[in-house]
């Protein structure tokens, strides 16, 4: 059956059960993923916005797939095998009473089982296995995967000592060449291109096939993971990095003190809570900020927003939008827009798309 063709996997908790504290839900889900990462080369990271590989949903009855829940008891949860879209997603029946203990239905134990499915495991015939089809409470403090569970998951992904090769670039190939790969932010930095994804960035040196993967924290320990937008003003040796309503300034590859600052200092209205993508055009000395289906234009010389904005992305960038994930400027005439696993080379002089590519086309995939 299907497996994830990468070792770095993201998850997002779409909504929370009212049965438990949010922190307890986060903890139970995190620990459930950890059970599987402990015995494989897989690494899991929680993201709070955007498209995660695995979406965790609490729902009751009919909830958008073929497998409506059945009220209290019976089916507790279900999860889809690896893949795009609904693939990997784990759904928990809100009609159960979810708990951190032996009363009701233990979320951690159920999540371990469902994440097994999300990773590609089927049911086990071993009653001691967490992948056995029926729920049975065991002490979560002494919980262990059975030999059958470990054998099953390692037959799909190998054992954890492969972890030691991450983030060795040679071992980043499966994730990098995944046809569904998308990026959070992309920017040039001198003759390099930085591609940000969760807590990693890939570094592409122009015209060279080799790429390297790094942890953001290894280069900039004070910066968060999940950078959402980035742009460079090369003439000033400056890079701006954005996450949520904050931004950081990097000068000569060093973070400036007194950051992060609020994005509202650029002149955004209060309803703007985050930037999806940003790009600086040195010809016009303007930065374009993309937020949902709109964009703003910022005059870097006068340090203020140009009048008449925001405008709709789709109105002024033919074929682009309605929303974008990332964008960068290159070769004096192109913007490269990223939308999910697709990328569009856009000639801003001709004002049209000149090429459609996969997002990871820069890496010789």
């Amino acid at each position: 059956g299907p497996v994830w063709r990468k070792h770095y996997i993201t998850y997002r908790i779409n909504n929370y059960t009212p049965d438990m504290n949010r922190e307890d839900v986060d903890y139970a889900i995190r620990k459930a993923f950890q059970v599987w990462s402990n015995v494989t080369p897989l690494k899991f990271s929680k993201i709070n916005t955007g498209m995660a590989d695995i979406l965790v949903v609490f729902a009751r009855g009919a909830h958008g797939d073929f497998h409506a829940f059945d009220g209290k008891g019976g089916i507790l949860a279900h999860a889809f095998g690896p893949g795009s879209g609904i693939g990997g997603d784990a759904h928990f029946d809100e009609d159960e009473f979810w708990t951190t203990h032996s009363g009701g239905t233990n979320l951690f134990l159920t999540a371990v089982h469902e994440i097994g499915h999300s990773l590609g495991l089927g049911h086990s015939s071993d009653p001691k296995a967490v992948m056995f089809p029926t729920y049975k409470y065991v002490d979560i403090n002494t919980f262990r995967l059975s030999a059958d569970d470990i054998r099953g998951i390692q037959s799909l992904y190998g054992d954890p000592k492969e972890n030691q090769r991450l983030p060795n670039p040679d071992n980043s190939e499966p994730a990098l060449c995944d046809p569904n790969l998308s990026f959070d932010a992309v920017t040039t930095v001198g003759n390099k291109i930085f591609f940000f994804k969760d807590r990693f960035f890939w570094l592409k040196v122009s015209e060279r096939p080799k790429t390297s993967v790094n942890l953001i924290s290894s280069l900039w320990p004070t910066l968060p993971s999940g950078i959402e937008a980035a742009y460079e003003i090369e003439a000033r040796n400056q890079v701006f990095l954005f996450k949520d309503d904050k931004y950081w300034l990097i000068s000569n590859l060093r973070p400036e003190p007194n950051y992060p600052k609020s994005i509202h200092s650029f002149g955004f209205p209060n309803f703007v809570k985050k930037i999806d993508a940003a790009v600086f055009n040195p010809r016009f000395y303007r930065t374009y900020f993309f937020v949902d289906n709109q964009y703003w234009r910022y005059d870097e010389r006068r340090q203020m927003m140009d009048p008449g904005y925001p405008k709709l992305i789709t109105k002024n960038f033919q074929g682009i939008g309605p929303k974008i994930d990332a964008v960068f400027y290159s070769k004096n005439k192109y913007y490269y827009f990223f939308q999910g696993s697709n990328q569009f080379e856009y000639d801003f002089l001709l004002q049209r798309i000149t090429k459609t590519l996969k997002s990871n086309s820069w890496f010789g995939c």
Epitope: H63, G64, G85
Partner: antibody, heavy 122, light 103 residues
């Protein structure tokens, strides 16, 4: 290359029976949910039935429940739809469609056959 | 039960036009919405899955957006081959279809 080829359609009287087949090739048939979707002349698409990779769980639209039976033979890479107690409103082109994955149906149909026409008329 | 309402049911447009078709669910379906194109006498073809992901081989002028209950399919610049009927779909439920005709 994924290919789905339906057969078995034709003219049948109300109350009669018909068995449709769908021969699959170009993918590992036993890994995927499979479905039947129909389209009455000049009308929209209507999902009819789905079957799990093993042939275990099956699902039906309310309009055909108790009259139609979906099955599969993984050794022959073939999907079937046995239609009994046929009614005039069952007249449609019947498509077989491949779901994108198992073990649960994603409800995402990435490949379709060309369809076979079933006409129920006296 | 979940219901899908697609609008408009028909639409006249010209080559080069920008066209938007909407689909609304009566309860949240997260991003579990797909779009198909069907030409007369042919089987439907998958265009967009999971609300916004472009199926391999589909031209980039097609895009999808939305989550929860409201979804849109946009064709940024209509081409002659785009005149067809479009369906939104979530699990076993299809929208009523939108017939896109030449003006």
């Amino acid at each position: 290359e994924v290919q789905l080829l339906e057969s078995g359609g034709g003219l049948v009287q109300p109350g009669g029976s018909l068995r449709l087949s769908c021969a699959a090739s170009g993918f590992t048939f036993s890994w995927y949910w499979m479905h039947w979707v129909r389209q009455a002349p000049g009308k929209g698409l209507e999902w009819v039935s789905g079957i799990s990779p093993s042939g275990g769980p099956t699902m039906y639209a309310d309009s055909v429940k108790g009259r139609f039976t979906i099955s599969r033979d993984n050794s022959k890479n073939t999907l079937y739809l046995q239609m009994n107690s046929l009614r005039a409103e069952d007249t449609a082109v019947y498509y077989c469609a491949k779901d994108i994955r198992g073990p649960y149906s994603s409800g995402l149909f990435d490949y379709w056959g060309r369809g076979t026409l079933v006409t129920v008329s006296s | 039960d979940i219901q899908m309402t697609q609008s408009p049911s028909s639409l006249s447009a010209s080559v080069g036009d920008r066209v938007t078709i909407t689909c609304r669910a009566n309860q949240s379906i997260y991003t579990y919405l797909n779009w198909y194109q069907q030409k007369p006498g042919k089987a439907p073809e998958l265009l967009i899955y999971a609300a916004s992901s472009l199926q391999s081989g589909v031209p980039s002028r097609f895009s999808g957006s939305g989550s929860g209950t409201d979804f849109t399919l946009t064709i940024s610049s209509l081409q002659p081959e785009d005149f067809a009927t479009y369906y939104c779909q979530q699990a076993g439920i299809f929208g009523q279809g939108t017939k896109l005709e030449i003006k």
